[in-house]
């Protein structure tokens, strides 16, 4: 069963600053995200950002900031201008709609025992993320092997029948040892959540990976179609119309400007759905 | 919690008309936008009309002058007149709460189970 999780923390910088995340864990593309607060998405709650993975972000006050992390979770940056947190006892609840599959809704509060300073809250995410794991891996390795190589050298220095070129065999023995770690950790790191197991993100989970962003297929038979299209797609005349994934929209010519990081396009790492479903008019 | 319920699809021969209707609730009605999305069988979705809360009517090209979409807003319902039916009107029928983007976008944000539309002789 899909689910959605929240998270909300206050910045240990800034006490008047929180940040939301929440993610969406289960199969499904996500065709749009509404993070409100008060209540849940049309049963009182307000508005505070909605993200489209083509169309972009729209945000109102507080929000500061609303992105994409990941193909699969976002994140909102709140300013608190009031002195007295208001954002303490708020609820803000996110809602991830895959049409026409289904929508799923949670919502979550910033725990009551909240000092920045002392505890850090749950991270849904892996702390490391994946490609930075995997270069420190890469570094750790290399200087293992540069290490390793050293100490051979230094060995041989003290042999009595000095021998400075090693055998064949040793120096493909010497490679094997060096790159079958790094190997290994690129293995290991392939899924993001293996080793990092919270409440949130169960291992089993088909996840995503944090640093799997790339534009979408722009071929036909029902591929979706977004911005990063455009060197490849003529260019549309104001009331032409696109079916894309997901939106509708009136004036193809007229594209809400497609700036920051919640522009990325990402596809479903599961493949991308044959789905169709923005428009245009005149 | 928002809830959407078609209804009047059915079978119907080519040239014919439907009308469908979506009764909708757990939501503020005059402030979202609305749409019909249809999905044929074995094809994507693709967006037939939409209509904001100014009551601007929006169609995709190739139903422009056989469908009419409204919106009743006192009834929280949304109509789509269907007229001159074809085969390729065949379909699913959703209907569809949106989220405005700019002037010109509706993503859909929630939807009903669908209606099925056939046009066949």
């Known amino acids: 069963t899909p689910e959605v999780w929240v998270q909300v923390q206050m910045e240990a910088t800034e006490l008047s600053s929180f940040t939301v995340h929440c993610g969406f864990l289960g199969p499904g593309s996500i065709s749009l995200v509404t993070v409100s607060w008060g209540g849940p998405d049309g049963a009182g709650g307000t508005k505070l950002a909605v993200l489209h993975p083509e169309l972009g972000t729209r945000q109102w006050a507080p929000a500061r900031q609303a992105r994409w992390e990941t193909q699969s979770s976002i994140s909102l940056a709140l300013e608190d201008s009031g002195a007295s947190s208001p954002f303490a006892n708020t609820t803000f609840c996110c809602k991830f709609a895959s049409f026409p599959e289904g929508s799923w809704e949670s919502c979550g509060s910033l725990p009551p025992s909240s000092d920045p300073g002392l505890s850090a809250p749950p991270t849904p995410v892996p702390i490391l993320r994946a490609d930075l794991a995997g270069i420190l891996g890469l570094s750790g390795v290399l200087l293992f092997g540069c290490g390793y190589l050293l100490h051979l050298l230094r060995r041989q220095k003290h042999r009595p029948t000095p021998r400075l070129q090693p055998s064949h065999t040793n120096s493909q023995a010497l490679t094997a040892q060096a790159w079958a770690p790094s190997q290994a950790s690129q293995a290991a790191l392939h899924d993001p959540y293996a080793t990092i197991n919270t409440s949130f993100c169960p291992a089993t989970l088909d996840t995503a990976h944090p640093n799997g962003w790339a534009s979408l297929p722009t071929h036909a038979a029902h591929q979706p179609q977004g911005p990063a299209a455009s060197a490849s797609t003529p260019i549309l005349a104001r009331g032409s119309f696109v079916s894309v994934e997901n939106g509708l929209y009136t004036q193809a010519g007229e594209r809400p400007p497609h700036t920051g990081p919640g522009l990325t396009l990402f596809p479903d790492c599961r493949g991308p759905r044959a789905v169709e479903g923005r428009f245009g008019v005149r | 919690e928002v809830q959407l319920v078609e209804s009047g699809g059915g079978l119907v021969q080519p040239g014919g008309s439907l009308r469908l209707s979506c009764a909708a609730s757990?939501?503020?009605?005059?402030?979202?936008?609305m749409g019909w999305f249809r999905q044929a069988p074995g094809k994507g979705l693709e967006g037939v009309a939409h209509i904001d809360s100014d009551g601007i009517p929006r169609y995709v090209d190739s139903v422009k002058g056989r469908f009419t979409i409204s919106r009743d807003n006192a009834k929280n319902s949304l109509y789509l007149q269907m007229n001159s039916l074809r085969a390729e009107d065949t379909a699913v029928y959703y209907c569809v709460v949106g989220f405005k983007f700019d002037e010109d976008y509706c993503a859909p944000n929630d939807w009903g189970q669908g209606t099925m539309v056939t046009v066949s002789s």
């Open positions: 757990g939501f503020t009605f005059s402030t979202d936008c």
